[in-house]
Interface confidence: medium
């Protein structure tokens, strides 16, 4: 057991938030400011991500975890870990290389980001369209036409969804 311990890498004892300092006889030193190590046994600390420009800090960097960014008002995240920010569009639009464009007929987008998606095809499920789709909203499918024969239970269509006002965040 003693032999195994003596062969063990002394750096493996360094916990997250520290690094194994070769310049100081492999002592575990705390990560310097603006750096972190998320796992033990690291020989260096990683530089913290800086949320600058169109990015803003969602979570501060600590000695054991990197900073996390999101986007400043009017922009939204794209990519893994919010690697990019792009301008918001309106609901009912998608961002193209030429700016925000209205969704084509038959498609919708109910968010300020992302792409226009096709309306649900109710007939694929043997249902009928209860509420028509718009650029901002998908269609609402109801019971199949056969279910609407006299004597069948009536279905009250939902109240149309109101587009939320773009009030401050």
């Amino acid at each position: 057991f003693e032999r195994t311990r003596s062969l063990q890498d002394p750096c493996s004892n360094c916990p997250a938030g520290t690094f194994c300092d070769n310049n100081r006889n492999q002592i575990c030193s705390p990560c310097p400011p603006n750096s972190f190590s998320s796992a033990g046994g690291q020989r260096t600390c990683d530089i913290c991500r800086q949320c600058k420009g169109v990015f803003r800090t969602r979570k501060e960097c600590s000695s054991t975890s990197n900073a996390e960014c999101d986007c400043t008002p009017g922009f939204h995240c794209l990519g893994a870990g919010c690697s990019m920010c792009e301008q918001d569009c309106k609901q009912g639009q998608e961002l193209t290389k030429k700016g925000c464009k209205d969704c084509c007929f038959g498609t919708f987008n109910d968010q300020k980001r992302g792409i226009c998606r096709p309306w649900t095809n109710c007939s694929l499920d043997g249902k009928s369209v209860l509420v028509n789709g718009t650029k901002e909203r998908d269609v609402v499918c109801g019971p199949s036409p056969a279910d609407l024969s006299p004597g069948a239970s009536s279905v009250t269509p939902p109240a149309p969804a109101r587009e939320p006002g773009h009030s401050p965040q």
């Epitope: 800086q50 949320c51 600058k52 420009g53 169109v54 803003r56 800090t57 400043t72 008002p73 009017g74 922009f75 301008q87 918001d88 569009c89 309106k90 609901q91 639009q93 961002l95 030429k98 700016g99 925000c100 300020k112 773009h166 401050p168 965040q169």
Partner: antibody, heavy 118, light 107 residues
Framework: QVQLQESGPGLVQPTQSLSITCTVS????????VHWVRQSPGKGLEWLGV???????DYNAAFISRLSISKDNSKSQVFFKMNSLQADDTAIYYC????????????WGQGTSVTVSS | DIVMTQSQKFMSTSVGDRVSVTCKAS??????VAWYQQKPGQSPKALIY???YRDSGVPDRFTGSGSGTDFTLTISNVQSEDLAEYLC?????????FGAGTKLELK
């Protein structure tokens, strides 16, 4: 070069509405947002709202009930309308472009002075 | 709303001096702060965004620093054309808010 120019009425009666047009050149409203900011001796610079490239708007909660911002991309114009003006709405009103790098104002119009008085 | 406080309304300086204008946010705004210069009768002009990034065409004697709640705009080797009002703005959250401004005057 990038330019923004506000045109407004100058004098507005109390309780009436204020309409200002911001005409831009040197950039496209399809790509850039435009902010509205006002400046008065008593309150300094106040951010009123913004219209983004896609036409979505964000307003200062203090003005949301009486403010609307719209635009016409083809005419390169942004329209500002504020209702129910009172004396303390007297200010210089600016439009300013939002760059693609942050939620700030990189180019400003020269401003239009608005006095609310009967 | 986030309050941006510029405690010094006026600062006196001489040409060639180095001067620091400060701004304090009422809560953490990261580095989401911009600085503007405004001369009498003119509209504001962007100098710095993201606390320390100079806007294009801004002379390198203007430098911004700070993060969290405390921010500084430093003008080294002040020129006569720098005599103006300097305003900070936070854009970490809506509503965007400005400081009341600091006027730079000649001693």
């Amino acid at each position: 070069q990038v330019q923004l120019q506000e045109s407004g009425p100058g004098l507005v009666q109390p309780t009436q509405s204020l309409s200002i047009t911001c005409t831009v050149s040197g950039f496209s409203l399809i790509s850039y947002g435009v902010h509205w900011v006002r400046q008065s001796p008593g309150k300094g610079l106040e951010w009123l709202g913004v219209i983004w490239s896609g036409g979505s708007t964000d307003y200062n909660a203090a003005f949301i009930s009486r403010l609307s911002i719209s635009k016409d991309n083809s005419k390169s114009q942004v329209f500002f309308k504020m209702n129910s003006l009172q004396a303390d709405d007297t200010a210089i009103y600016y439009c300013a472009r939002n760059p693609l790098t942050a939620t700030v104002m990189d180019y400003w119009g020269q401003g239009t002075s608005v006095t609310v008085s009967s | 709303d986030i309050v941006m406080t510029q405690s010094q309304k006026f600062m006196s300086t001489s040409v060639g001096d180095r001067v620091s204008v400060t701004c304090k946010a009422s809560q953490n705004v990261g580095t989401n702060v911009a600085w503007y210069q405004q001369k009498p009768g003119q509209s504001p002009k962007a100098l710095i965004y993201s606390a320390s990034y100079r806007d294009s065409g801004v002379p390198d004697r203007f430098t911004g620093s700070g993060s969290g709640t405390d921010f500084t705009l430093t003008i080294s080797n002040v020129q006569s054309e720098d005599l103006a009002e300097y305003l900070c703005q936070q854009y970490n959250s809506y509503p965007l808010t400005f400081g009341a401004g600091t006027k730079l005057e000649l001693k």
